[in-house]
């Protein structure tokens, strides 16, 4: 693989455009944050492949690692993955954003870790601090990765100065998960509450008689202490519980609540954390998308599913053509809304042995006192195609006609075919397709009608045969998205005194 320019580190101007190329003997691809950004493929006469990454209107957020790999990387040799690091110094971007999981660093042993606070400019001086302290910690910094070292279980922030303003990173929480004889569990009555509602958390320790609980929570950091209550669960020996209760929650109470438990005899400790979100008001949000047109097959069962998030628990109603639906006593419709997690719901409408009359406009509405959401779609009932009639007649004009009539939903296509050699066809000889060809032998006339009440299409097709000089097997095939049906008739010449 050859990367141009080779790097391994580039510093680019904000708002400019920059072009990178990567070439190799097989198709190559650029990757950024485990995804493939828009790029363009080109090829040389000697068979070399290249991928061109055009970075336009660069911002600090384009800072980071870029990799070029073979499109079908099978081996893991070093030459099969080239790394390039790009800086775009941008005074409007302080620290590069982190995913939530990067802010929590968990350890099971004493080992070197990296606090991944990164800036857009390699010239900036970056320092590391404990969240509550001003003293810079003596830890080496790599502008491409962050601070690497051995850290205690604390909260850390990075600081830098851009121009004349000091910028702080998000807080990074280092947790050393020690294998310990103390086993702590933390749970909340609710992890999402509205402002004004109560937050109640419980921290339970099993198997110890004397322990010390210490809670850390957002209010504590602003000096507003809450006194926890400790009790013993009498029906369970050595189960000790600490309850942290915050009445009338405020938005600032959102954050991480940590229960740290220590026992002094063996100097064991353990801690667990839980995130609490305080929202201004309740919400209902759809997750994923449901197409505006849904299909069901006649006489089959069909479940239509809507996934959404809500707090507080909502009321869910389903409507068909603006009329409220309920579970039918005949078992034709089943409605269910399941709570799959604290704030996530799945609502399902099941139509059992679908009937044509169940086509129509469906709406699901989820609501509570603070918010509502609704989702609508059209349900089309697909009916497998069937040939209802295939008949042959001899009008006075001398020609012979074959009429084929059938129905289905969606609209069926009609295919006419014929076989002249009755002994060998269709096993040995494929049938010949018939239609409005340039030949005078056959002519086709097809009419389509939509039957509103039955909600299906009817196709009537008439095939006119000019000269039938020997018995002819004529086949009418109707086909649609959910099936096909065929009927066959044998057409004999006028002159023959019998029909098979």
């Amino acid at each position: 693989l050859v990367v141009t320019p080779p790097g391994p580190e580039l510093v680019l101007n904000v708002s400019s455009t920059f072009v990178l190329t990567c070439s190799g003997s097989a198709p190559v691809v650029w990757e950024r944050m485990s995804q493939e950004p828009p790029q363009e493929m080109a090829k040389a006469q000697d068979g070399t492949f290249s991928s061109v990454l055009t970075l336009t209107n660069l911002t600090g957020l384009d800072t980071g690692e870029y990799f070029c790999t073979h499109n079908d990387s099978r081996g893991l040799e070093t030459d099969e993955r080239k790394r390039l690091y790009i800086f775009v110094p941008d005074p409007t971007v302080g620290f590069l954003p982190n995913d939530a999981e990067e802010l929590f660093i968990f350890l099971t042993e004493i080992t070197e870790i990296t606090i991944p606070c990164r800036v857009t400019d390699p010239q900036l001086v970056v320092t590391l601090h404990e969240k509550k302290g001003d003293v810079a910690l003596p830890v080496p910094y790599d502008h491409q990765r962050g601070f690497s070292g051995i850290f205690e279980d604390r909260s850390y922030i990075c600081k830098t100065t851009i121009g004349d303003r000091e910028v702080d990173s998000d807080a990074y929480y280092v947790y050393r998960l020690q294998v310990s004889s103390i086993n702590v569990s933390v749970n909340a009555v609710q992890t999402v509450v509205r402002q004004g509602e109560n937050i109640t958390l419980m921290c339970i320790v099993i198997g110890n008689e004397v322990v010390n609980f210490e809670w850390t929570y957002p209010r504590k950091e602003s000096g507003r202490l809450v006194e926890p209550v400790t009790d013993f669960l009498l029906d369970m020996p050595y189960h000790i519980r600490s309850i942290l209760h915050i009445p009338s929650a405020e938005l600032e109470d959102s954050g991480t609540y940590t229960c740290n438990v220590t026992e002094s005899v063996n100097d064991h400790q353990d801690e667990k954390a839980i995130n609490i979100t305080v929202v201004e008001s309740g919400y209902v949000r759809l997750l994923g998308e449901v197409g505006t047109l849904q299909f069901a097959e006649l006489h089959r069962s069909r479940t239509l599913q809507v996934v959404f998030e809500a707090y507080p628990p909502p009321t869910v109603l389903w409507f068909k053509d603006n009329r409220t639906l309920g579970d039918s006593s005949a078992g034709e419709i089943a409605l269910s809304t399941r709570n799959v997690s604290e704030t996530r719901y799945v609502s399902e409408l099941t139509l059992v042995r679908v009937k044509v009359a169940e086509a129509g406009h469906y709406t699901m509405r989820a609501f509570h006192e603070d918010a509502e959401v609704q989702l609508s779609f059209q349900l089309q009932i697909n009916v497998p195609v069937r040939v209802l009639e295939l008949s042959e007649s001899h009008p006075d004009s001398g020609e012979q006609t074959v009429r084929c009539r059938g129905r289905g939903m969606p609209q069926p296509n009609i295919i006419w075919s014929a076989c002249r050699d009755l002994k060998r066809c269709p096993r040995e000889l494929p049938p010949t397709l018939l239609g409005n060809s340039s030949e005078e032998e056959s002519q086709l006339e097809t009419n389509v009608t939509y039957w509103e009440e039955e909600q299906e299409f009817e196709v009537v097709s008439t095939l006119r045969l000019q000269h039938v000089d020997r018995p002819l097997s004529v086949r009418c095939t109707l086909r649609n998205a959910v099936g096909q049906d065929t009927q066959e008739v044998i057409v004999v010449p006028h002159s023959l005194p019998f029909k098979v």
Partner: nanobody, 113 residues
Framework: EVQLVESGGGLAQAGGSLRLSCVAS????????MAWYRQAPGKQRELVAH??????YYVASVEGRFTISRANAKDTWYLQMNSLKPEDTGVYYC????????WSQGTQVTVSS
Amino acid sequence: EVQLVESGGGLAQAGGSLRLSCVASGNIDSANGMAWYRQAPGKQRELVAHITSGTSYYVASVEGRFTISRANAKDTWYLQMNSLKPEDTGVYYCFPIGLSAHWSQGTQVTVSS
């Protein structure tokens, strides 16, 4: 700061030819090659060809019809376009590989059928 000036565009018949030139000034010696792009009306700018380390690369739609080259003067690049098609119509831009720069005005190519 790199300055780019494209020329040679114009009106051509389908099947005809045009040769586009790109004259670059500034610290162009630092570039690792040159790319040609085009932008058809109402569409996104797209790569046409590029030359890197002396090797020329072409996108599938122009392969065998277009040729990218560099003049002996070192600061000039060409795009020879043969067997032109109406879908080759657009504004053509050159852009250096491996240099922070800004797009220039480009040169308009119109191919009539």
